[in-house]
Amino acid sequence: EGVAAALTPERLLEWQDKGIFVIQSESLKKCIQAGKSVLTLENCKQANKHMLWKWVSNHGLFNIGGSGCLGLNFSAPEQPLSLYECDSTLVSLRWRCNRKMITGPLQYSVQVAHDNTVVASRKYIHKWISYGSGGGDICEYLHKDLHTIKGNTHGMPCMFPFQYNHQWHHECTREGREDDLLWCATTSRYERDEKWGFCPDPTSAEVGCDTIWEKDL
């Protein structure tokens, strides 16, 4: 998970291959960074892991550095946006992506205030692109369900991010396993529900078919 203090274009492209991107305002040319309590627009050239985002399960938008999801507060929807636990029930964590716009319920969309904080507003001004991708639409990185194999949830898709060992995982992990197989939880909290499955690993050649797949009798 180590991310260099400043992400090189090559490093950015590697992240984009994994569905991880930096959100840049098309008009202001600045990028969204997650701070302790608010999101702000900052110089994209100082990109760091708090500028890295990934579309996750249930239309969530996960910040890699802050290990939280973008949330719209039920109690004060037009306050500056911030990160929340990805299974919080006090906020709306779902965002729709369409034509470079990030929209939530009641037609709130992700916008920028005069002080460069990121807010939800019904004024549709800001369009968002993926920094370092030649103006690519962040909607291109939308989450696709990854269905599990074996485990105990009958092929249910991975829930990303999921919390295991006090850490939020936005991709399959080998942590906690001695056999080096990739796995994920199929609910947001592994320790609470213990629902899990193996992840299909197209890169792993040494794992035999019968390790994961059930044989026809």
Partner: antibody, heavy 116, light 107 residues
């Protein structure tokens, strides 16, 4: 246990006023957007008004705009609906509910009857 | 305002049946839709939000689907306590609107 309980309903004449209250318990009240929704006899549910946790964002259905006022007292975990210029078609069971977008918790309701 | 139209208005079914209720919006509401159940003398309760997410504590026989303008609520195997009135509600716009309801009655 999380609970919402409405009060203040009753019989009122057309043109009259009424103030409904909703007492909340078991939740951090200031963190929740709150709403009034009504169910008129023989009709479907109708959203009436919403208020955000800090009272900065308030919205009303067109049918009650200018006649009803939603407010809240976070210190006392209370929600209010001040209704004036009441009409016969305001007759309904009025429910207090939490949630800013959809309504995830409801009180049992209080009946408002507008009749001469 | 966005109009929400539910069909059928009344549906007669038996315990154990699989039933599907539909809700149509007059314009696209993305997935900002909730389903509620109301039984006589009780307050409504939310079953599904954001078109397909099951509210905590709601039995898994309830499921929702759809996006844009067309939505469905499916009950996979009707139980006696499921009979009542079902409402859909959009929260795409500030003026949140409900459908007129579908009455689910015992055949």
């Amino acid at each position: 246990e999380v609970q919402l309980l409405e009060s203040g309903g009753g019989l009122v004449k057309p043109g009259g006023s009424l103030r409904l209250s909703c007492a909340a318990s078991g939740l951090i009240f200031k963190n929740y957007g709150m709403n009034w929704v009504r169910l008129a006899p023989g009709k479907g549910l109708e959203w009436v008004a919403s208020i955000s946790g800090n009272s900065n964002y308030i919205s009303y259905a067109d049918s009650v705009k200018g006649r009803f006022t939603i407010s809240r007292d976070n210190a006392n975990n209370s929600l209010f609906l001040q209704m004036s210029s009441l009409r016969a078609d305001d007759t309904a069971v009025y429910y207090c509910s939490s949630g800013y977008f959809y309504f995830d918790l409801w009180g049992p309701g209080t009946l408002v009857t507008v009749s001469s | 305002d966005i109009q929400m139209t539910q069909s059928p208005s009344i549906l007669s079914a038996s315990v154990g049946d699989r039933v599907t209720l539909t809700c149509r919006a007059s314009q696209s509401i993305s997935s900002w839709l909730a389903w509620y159940q109301q039984t006589p003398g009780k307050a409504p309760r939310v079953l599904i939000y954001e078109a397909s997410t099951l509210e905590v504590g709601v039995p898994s026989r309830f499921s929702g689907s759809g996006s844009g303008t067309d939505f469905t609520l499916t009950i996979s195997s009707l139980q006696p306590e499921d009979f009542g009135t079902y409402f859909c509600q959009q929260y795409h716009t500030d003026s949140r609107t409900f459908g007129q309801g579908t009455i689910l009655e015992i055949k």
